[in-house]
């Protein structure tokens, strides 16, 4: 079974700063901001059947996600 891509929570680089829950690390400004500011993928409501936008990101191939890591995004530590 495929896991979703990891979020900015990488284990192979030191975390410059921890993010509290509901915050995400913004790579461009290099600090934690409210996840709602980052155009994070929004879960579809149950039963939603409309097709996804043509080029929206989808959790599909693994990007080295560790066992048990959820699909993007994961608030918290980088």
């Amino acid at each position: 079974m495929r896991r979703g891509p990891r979020s900015l929570r990488g284990r192979d680089a030191p975390a410059p700063t921890p993010c509290v829950p509901a915050e995400c690390f913004d790579l461009l400004v290099r600090h934690c901001v409210a996840c709602g500011l980052l155009r994070t993928p929004r879960p579809k409501p149950a039963g939603a059947s409309s097709p996804a936008p043509r080029t929206a990101l989808q959790p599909q191939e693994s990007v080295g996600a560790g066992a048990g890591e959820a699909a993007l995004p994961l608030p918290g530590l980088l």
Partner: antibody
């Protein structure tokens, strides 16, 4: 679904200022990063810059002295101004937005051709 | 700026053949365990379309014949069996740091 639509004059005279607007629907420009990219005829893609959720901007150093990106949150639009244009600024201009956390530009406008000519 | 070099500039192939496109970065585009390399397809008169993000992840609606691989500075886009609609220009793009940069493109043309 997020949609982006560029608008503005298709013809600009040399030395004048190119002005384009990107109208966004399906998401708020107070979330995410909102970019401008251009493509010279028959050439590759060149990154111009962004305006962020907070209103902060970044401009490609190669164009920085001539570029201004601003926004109107009440209209959910953001704009590009490029001053002192020459024929070398003739290009298709795209607005685009990346998703988090990979910053891959998954939403694009259809592009608008701007020709600089007298 | 991170410079991306794509090769070959042109690839002449027939439908059904395998296409292998290369992108080399002037420095690593890896950060925090992620490869910030994306691939786009562009057809004449159209905006670029995101195919692959974070080196190996297909965007929504992208067929399984498209795959990406690589890390650090060397990346590959593979089209396992070319369909007629796949003949286009392909660009790699790094999103590790601004200014975000694009490769010069590889044109996949019908042989």
């Amino acid at each position: 679904e997020v949609q982006l639509q560029e608008s503005g004059p298709g013809l600009v005279k040399p030395s004048q200022t190119l002005s384009l607007t990107c109208t966004v629907s399906g998401d708020s420009i107070t979330s995410g990063y909102w970019n401008w990219i251009r493509q010279h005829p028959g050439k590759g893609l060149e990154y111009i810059g962004y305006i962020s959720y907070s209103g902060s901007t970044y401009y490609n150093p190669s164009l920085k002295s001539r570029v201004t990106i601003s926004r109107d949150t009440s209209k959910n639009q953001y704009s590009l101004k490029l001053s002192s244009v020459t024929a070398a600024d003739t290009a298709v201009y795209y607005c685009a937005s990346p998703n988090y956390p990979f910053y891959a530009m998954d939403y694009w406008g259809q592009g608008t051709l701007v020709t600089v000519s007298s | 700026d991170i410079v991306l070099t794509q090769s070959p500039a042109t690839l002449s192939l027939s439908p059904g053949e395998r296409a292998t496109l290369s992108c080399r970065a002037s420095e690593s585009v890896d950060n925090y365990g992620i490869s910030f390399m994306n691939w786009f397809q562009q057809k004449p008169g159209q905006a670029p379309r995101l195919l692959i993000y974070a080196a190996s992840n297909r965007a929504t609606g992208i067929p399984a014949r498209f795959s990406g691989s690589g890390s650090g500075t060397d990346f590959t886009l593979t089209i396992s069996s070319l369909e007629p609609e796949d003949f286009a220009v392909y660009y790699c793009q790094q999103s590790k740091e601004v200014p975000w940069t694009f490769g010069g493109g590889t044109k996949v043309e019908i042989k």
